[in-house]
Amino acid sequence: GARRLRVRSQRSRDSSVPTQCNQTECFDPLVRNCVSCELFHTPDTGHTSSLEPGTALQPQEG
């Protein structure tokens, strides 16, 4: 798919505006930045993730 633009203007600690990151990144609300993002790797539990990196970004989880 098309790569998302990396947006680095979000610096407000209270901001709730989603930040778009590129395909291999996701938004980390702790550091208010786009960072490298990996797929979940938890074979020992029932938890799985079908999301690709960078999808459905909402900056409200850390």
Epitope: L30, V35, E61, G62
Partner: antibody, heavy 125, light 107 residues
Framework: EVQLVESGGGLVQPGGSLRLSCAAS????????IHWVRQAPGKGLEWVAW????????DYADSVKGRFTISADTSKNTAYLQMNSLRAEDTAVYYC??????????????????WGQGTLVTVSS | DIQMTQSPSSLSASVGDRVTITCRAS??????VAWYQQKPGKAPKLLIY???FLYSGVPSRFSGSGSGTDFTLTISSLQPEDFATYYC?????????FGQGTKVEIK
């Protein structure tokens, strides 16, 4: 293999300075955030500072703000903690750690997955 | 800052026991909680991230649950190597804050 190695700790007098280094291997620090966490003798963990080396954005605990400076040299894949105006209460083992993010519907599901071995800073006269 | 309050601060248990440690956040932190294990003289090790996801290589006897303000770390059957201090940490917002720790000792 991901590895973080701290150095630079030691004995320093109150009011003195030290610079800690955190040399990373097995990953590129510009892709993650790097954190310093300290642990005073017999006490719990206290976050000190973080940096996103890709753009130099930083933040600090109130207890060290204005005295400590976190920085990174991406060409050396190394993060630093410059500690000035040191106080007795800064005595601790200092760890650097990498924060990893996993993709989730809310963005980053993150935690500090790799830690260095720690370096002891003792502030005493 | 968000305060993380762990309980108990220490506990004594035997090998094979089921152990539960709780952590309460002073405000909603969604599922942005991790759990770490630390042994004396060693760096912390990540056990659980995002409240309930088992980190790679961690034995399945460890599990985490919770969201919002109340979180739990459970060890289903305590093993000799599990005697250590456990910390919760929130990373919902900066500054990331740790609980005060729970020391699990041999009964």
């Amino acid at each position: 293999e991901v590895q973080l190695v701290e150095s630079g700790g030691g004995l320093v007098q109150p009011g003195g300075s030290l610079r800690l280094s955190c040399a990373a291997s097995g990953f590129t620090i510009s892709s993650n955030s790097i954190h310093w966490v300290r642990q005073a003798p017999g006490k719990g963990l206290e976050w000190v500072a973080w940096i996103t080396p890709s753009d130099g954005n930083t933040d600090y605990a109130d207890s060290v703000k204005g005295r400590f400076t976190i920085s990174a040299d991406t060409s050396k894949n190394t993060a630093y903690l410059q500690m000035n105006s040191l106080r007795a209460e800064d005595t601790a083992v200092y760890y650097c750690a990498r924060r990893v993010c996993y993709s989730s519907v809310r963005g980053c599901a993150g935690a500090m997955d790799y830690w260095g071995q720690g370096t002891l800073v003792t502030v005493s006269s | 800052d968000i305060q993380m309050t762990q309980s108990p601060s220490s506990l004594s248990a035997s090998v094979g026991d089921r152990v539960t440690i709780t952590c309460r956040a002073s405000q909603d932190v969604s599922t942005a909680v991790a759990w770490y294990q630390q042994k004396p003289g060693k760096a912390p090790k990540l056990l659980i991230y995002s409240a309930s996801f088992l980190y790679s290589g961690v034995p399945s006897r460890f599990s985490g649950s919770g969201s919002g303000t109340d979180f739990t770390l459970t060890i289903s059957s305590l093993q000799p190597e599990d005697f250590a201090t456990y910390y919760c940490q929130q990373s919902y917002t900066t500054p990331p804050t740790f609980g005060q720790g729970t020391k699990v000792e041999i009964k």
